[in-house]
C-alpha cells in the first residue's frame, strides 16, 4: 500500500490514520472503523468509507450527518460488513439479526429477511445514472463544454478511466452522467464506478473525502456549476429481487439528496 511518504498522509482518504509501520517500513494508512490498510494512490472502496463514517466519533464526524445517504424506503445508514479486499459482502445484517442482500455499491436489492437469508454472490452494479439539477444561471451551459469538464473531472480527480463515462446528457437545468462498467470490462487497478460515484456524491455535498484538497470547484468556461439536487440510480447486472408489491413502486434503487 502506498501513501504520501513525506509526512505519511493519505491524499485520497481523510478518514484514515497513517503511520510509518507498513511493509518495508513504508507509510501505512488504515481506514477508520475497519482498520484495513488502504491504497492511497487510488480511491478507497465505498464499503470501507461507509464503515469509517459509521465509526467516527460523534464529535469528529465532519463528513456526514446520520440522516444522510438514506435509501428511499428509509433503510438509512448502516455499518456494512466488508470483505478482505474492502468490498461489500453480499449479505448484510444489522444487530437485530435482520439481513438483506446488497449490490456492489452497498444498496439493498432484496427484501429483508432473517439470518437464514442467502445471498449467493455480490451482484455488480454495472450502470450508474447520476441525475443533477444545477442552480439557475444566466444561460444554459454549452453541452460540449459541460461534457468535457465532467469527463475531465472523473478522469483527473477520481482517476476513472474515460471509457467508463458512457455519456453526459444535458437539458437545462438537468445534467445526467452515465457511468457503465461491466465485470468483464473492469481490469485490475481500474477505479470502480461505484467508488467514483460515491466520491463525486460527497464532493457535490461539499464533504470531500480527499485529504487537505480544496472542495470541488466545478466550473464550465469559468462559470460556476452549482448543484442543488442529486439523484443517483443504480442498475445491477442481475435485476433486484423485491416482492411484487415493492416492484410496483420502485423500478430502480436510488438515493435522493436535497
Amino acid at each position: 500500500h502506498t501513501a504520501a511518504q513525506d509526512n505519511c498522509t493519505c491524499p485520497t482518504n481523510k478518514m484514515t490514520v497513517c503511520s510509518p509501520d507498513g511493509p518495508g517500513g513504508r507509510c501505512q494508512c488504515r481506514a477508520l472503523g475497519s482498520g484495513m490498510a488502504v491504497d492511497c494512490s487510488t480511491l478507497t472502496s465505498k464499503c470501507l468509507l461507509l464503515k469509517a463514517r459509521m465509526s467516527a466519533p460523534k464529535n469528529a464526524r465532519t463528513l456526514v450527518r446520520p440522516s444522510e445517504h438514506a435509501l428511499v424506503d428509509n433503510d438509512g445508514l448502516y455499518d456494512p460488513d466488508c470483505d478482505p479486499e474492502g468490498r461489500f459482502k453480499a449479505r448484510q445484517c444489522n444487530q437485530t439479526s435482520v439481513c438483506w442482500c446488497v449490490n456492489s455499491v452497498g444498496v439493498r436489492r432484496t427484501d429483508k429477511g432473517d439470518l437464514s437469508l442467502r445471498c449467493d454472490e455480490l451482484v455488480r452494479t454495472h450502470h450508474i445514472l447520476i441525475d443533477l439539477r444545477h442552480r439557475p444561471t444566466a444561460g444554459a451551459f454549452n453541452h460540449s463544454d459541460l461534457d468535457a469538464e465532467l469527463r475531465r473531472l472523473f478522469r483527473e480527480r477520481y482517476r476513472l478511466h474515460p471509457k467508463f463515462v458512457a455519456a453526459v446528457h444535458y437539458e437545462q437545468p438537468t445534467i445526467q452522467i452515465e457511468l457503465r462498467q461491466n465485470t468483464s470490462q473492469k481490469a485490475a487497478g481500474d477505479v470502480d464506478i461505484g467508488d467514483a460515484a460515491y466520491y463525486f456524491e460527497r464532493d457535490i455535498k461539499g464533504e470531500s473525502l480527499f485529504q487537505g484538497r480544496g472542495g470541488l470547484d466545478l466550473r464550465v468556461r469559468g462559470e460556476p456549476l452549482q448543484v442543488e439536487r442529486t439523484l443517483i440510480y443504480y442498475l445491477d447486472e442481475i435485476p433486484p429481487k423485491f416482492s411484487m408489491k415493492r416492484l410496483t413502486h420502485h423500478h430502480h434503487h436510488h438515493h435522493h439528496h436535497h
Partner: antibody, heavy 115, light 107 residues
Framework: QVQLVQSGAEVKKPGASVKVSCKAS????????IHWVRQAPGQGLEWIGT????????VYNQKFRDRATMTADRSISTAYIELSRLRSDDTAVYYC????????WGQGTTVTVSS | EIVLTQSPATLSLSPGERATLSCRAS??????IHWFQQKPGGSPRLLIK???ESISGIPSRFSGSGSGTDFTLTISSLEPEDFAVYYC?????????FGQGTKLEIK
C-alpha cells in the same frame, strides 16, 4: 533507543478500577500506534485495543469496549489504559506495545484482582 | 474477527534440528502476519514482520514465509535458547488477534 516503561504491579478488589501507564521514549510518540495486550496466567496473548497518540483515535476489542478506556498524554509521551469493574478473570500481565507489528514491548504490569 | 490457528500446539525437537511452525488465518490477510517469541516471565519479542521481513538483531536462523491464509515460521537449526512459546499475530484489520501459541520444547 526505543523504550516502553510501564507502571508497577497492582492488587485490586473485584469491582474496582485500575489504571496502567506506559511511558515511551526514543522515538516520536505521536507517529506510532500504541497497543494494549494482556496475558492471563498460563494463557496466550489477548489484544485489548490500540490508540493513535497523535489524535487519540482509539479502537477496542469488542470484549473490552464497555470496561476499558485508553488515553494518551502527548506532553509526557505516555499512554494509559484504565479497566473498570474488575473481575477475578482480569488477573493478568498487561503489556503495551508499539506499531502494527508490536516491535517494542513494555516490561508488563501484573494486575491481580482478588477479594 | 480473523481467527489464527497455530499448529502444532507443542513441538518436541532437539538442538540442531529444523523447526517448522504453522499459522493459518480464517480469511485472506495478505502478508499481514507477524511472529513473536516469548520466554517464561518475559515480554514477547518480535521475530518476523509482514510474513517474511527480518528484524534487526534477530538471528538469521529465523525466517518466515507465506501469504493469504497460510504462514510458516522456520528456525533452520535450533539453539538451546530457542525453546520457548511462539505466537503469530495479524494486523490486517481490527480487531488484531493472536494465535494460541506453539510451545517448542526440548526432546
Amino acid at each position: 533507543q526505543v523504550q516502553l516503561v510501564q507502571s508497577g504491579a497492582e492488587v485490586k478488589k473485584p469491582g474496582a478500577s485500575v489504571k496502567v501507564s506506559c511511558k515511551a521514549s526514543g522515538y516520536t510518540f505521536t507517529t506510532h500506534w500504541i497497543h494494549w495486550v494482556r496475558q492471563a496466567p498460563g494463557q496466550g496473548l489477548e489484544w485489548i485495543g490500540t490508540i493513535f497518540p497523535s489524535n487519540a483515535y482509539a479502537v477496542y476489542n469488542q470484549k473490552f469496549r464497555d470496561r476499558a478506556t485508553m488515553t494518551a498524554d502527548r506532553s509526557i509521551s505516555t499512554a494509559y489504559i484504565e479497566l473498570s469493574r474488575l473481575r477475578s478473570d482480569d488477573t493478568a500481565v498487561y503489556y503495551c506495545a508499539r506499531a502494527s507489528y508490536f516491535d517494542y514491548w513494555g516490561q508488563g504490569t501484573t494486575v491481580t484482582v482478588s477479594s | 474477527e480473523i481467527v489464527l490457528t497455530q499448529s502444532p500446539a507443542t513441538l518436541s525437537l532437539s538442538p540442531g534440528e529444523r523447526a517448522t511452525l504453522s499459522c493459518r488465518a480464517s480469511q485472506n490477510i495478505g502478508t499481514s502476519i507477524h511472529w513473536f517469541q516469548q520466554k517464561p516471565g518475559g515480554s514477547p519479542r518480535l521475530l518476523i514482520k509482514y510474513a517474511s521481513e527480518s528484524i534487526s538483531g534477530i538471528p538469521s536462523r529465523f525466517s518466515g514465509s507465506g501469504s493469504g491464509t497460510d504462514f510458516t515460521l522456520t528456525i533452520s537449526s535450533l539453539e538451546p535458547e530457542d525453546f520457548a512459546v511462539y505466537y503469530c499475530q495479524h494486523s490486517h484489520s481490527w480487531p488484531f488477534t493472536f494465535g494460541q501459541g506453539t510451545k517448542l520444547e526440548i526432546k
